[in-house]
């Protein structure tokens, strides 16, 4: 015997107490598949969340984050504060990247500059809080007679060294 509830389309629920009739989901609820005995309560995008897609009778609302925040987790289950490039978010708020590290995004952690010497290369462009170092050709490639690259002026940070990590 076919389950009478299987005839109930998405956007309805099969009402056990009403001889399996298909009742529409009430406002702010939905069923995304047919044959459901319940409707799901719509997600509400409140506070730091904002509505990216309205709930319908057949699909849930989708949230993103208000400006200054970004989504974390599956389906944007959390909003996390943005920081500036050159910073990372700590328990005490946004903090500048330590010397020798950088972050080129508004989210995430500060990462150590690339150590060019590990690849046998030289530093072509110094790193900053916002940008990684740019590695250039190996020092051997800069032998006299080869087209030389003038090394850039050091960044205006005292004792700017490229192998320091914190």
């Amino acid at each position: 015997l076919q389950d009478p509830c299987s005839n109930c389309p998405a956007g309805t629920f099969c009402d056990n107490n009403r001889n399996q009739i298909c009742s529409p989901c009430p406002p702010n609820s939905f069923s995304s598949a047919g044959g459901q005995r319940t409707c799901d309560i719509c997600r509400q995008c409140k506070g730091v969340f904002r509505t990216r897609k309205e709930c319908s009778s057949t699909s849930n609302a989708e949230c993103d984050c208000t400006p200054g925040f970004h989504c974390l987790g599956a389906g944007c289950s959390m909003c996390e504060q943005d920081c500036k490039q050159g910073q990372e978010l700590t328990k005490k708020g946004c903090k500048d990247c330590c010397f020798g590290t950088f972050n080129d995004q508004k989210r995430g952690i500060c990462r150590p500059w690339t150590n060019c010497s590990l690849d046998g290369k030289s530093v072509l462009v110094n790193g900053t809080k916002e940008r990684d170092v740019v590695c250039g050709p190996s020092p051997a490639d800069l032998s006299p007679g080869a087209s030389s690259v003038t090394p850039p002026a050091p960044a205006r940070e005292p004792g700017h060294h490229h192998h320091h990590h914190h």
């Epitope: 629920f13 009402d15 056990n16 107490n17 989901c25 009430p26 406002p27 702010n28 609820s29 005995r37 319940t38 409707c39 799901d40 309560i41 509400q44």
Partner: nanobody, 120 residues
Framework: QVQLVESGGGTVQPGDSLRLSCAAS????????VGWFRQAPGKERQYVGT??????HYGDFENNRFTISRDNAKNTVYLQMDNLKPEDTAVYYC???????????????QGQGTQVTVSS
């Protein structure tokens, strides 16, 4: 942690009315359907009804004697019970869920219950 606290139970005579209240602390009812269940001594738990977004769904035994309503300002849900009968004697539980109706679901949270006795 969500806490649901029922109140308003007591002993009444057949034909009388009672209004049960369910107050939520730790979270508002905004995002949840609110339901009522009841359990009489020695019997299985019985679904009474669910309220969500202005709509109420009821179990199949009330014959329009029970009405669920909600006061958002007070973060409280009510179960109005009229023309009470001795067979309505039970512990009444308030519950919340992300499903509507709650006839076939296990609630996310449930209160401790309030006793209703209908006796002459």
């Amino acid at each position: 942690q969500v806490q649901l606290v029922e109140s308003g139970g007591g002993t009444v005579q057949p034909g009388d009315s009672l209004r049960l209240s369910c107050a939520a602390s730790g979270r508002t009812f905004d995002n949840y359907a609110v339901g009522w269940f009841r359990q009489a001594p020695g019997k299985e738990r019985q679904y009474v009804g669910t309220y969500w977004s202005g709509y109420a769904h009821y179990g199949d035994f009330e014959n329009n004697r029970f009405t669920i309503s909600r006061d958002n300002a007070k973060n409280t849900v009510y179960l109005q019970m009229d023309n009470l009968k001795p067979e309505d004697t039970a512990v009444y539980y308030c519950a919340i869920s992300l499903k509507y109706p709650m006839a076939t679901v296990t609630p996310d949270y449930q209160g401790q219950g309030t006793q209703v006795t209908v006796s002459s």
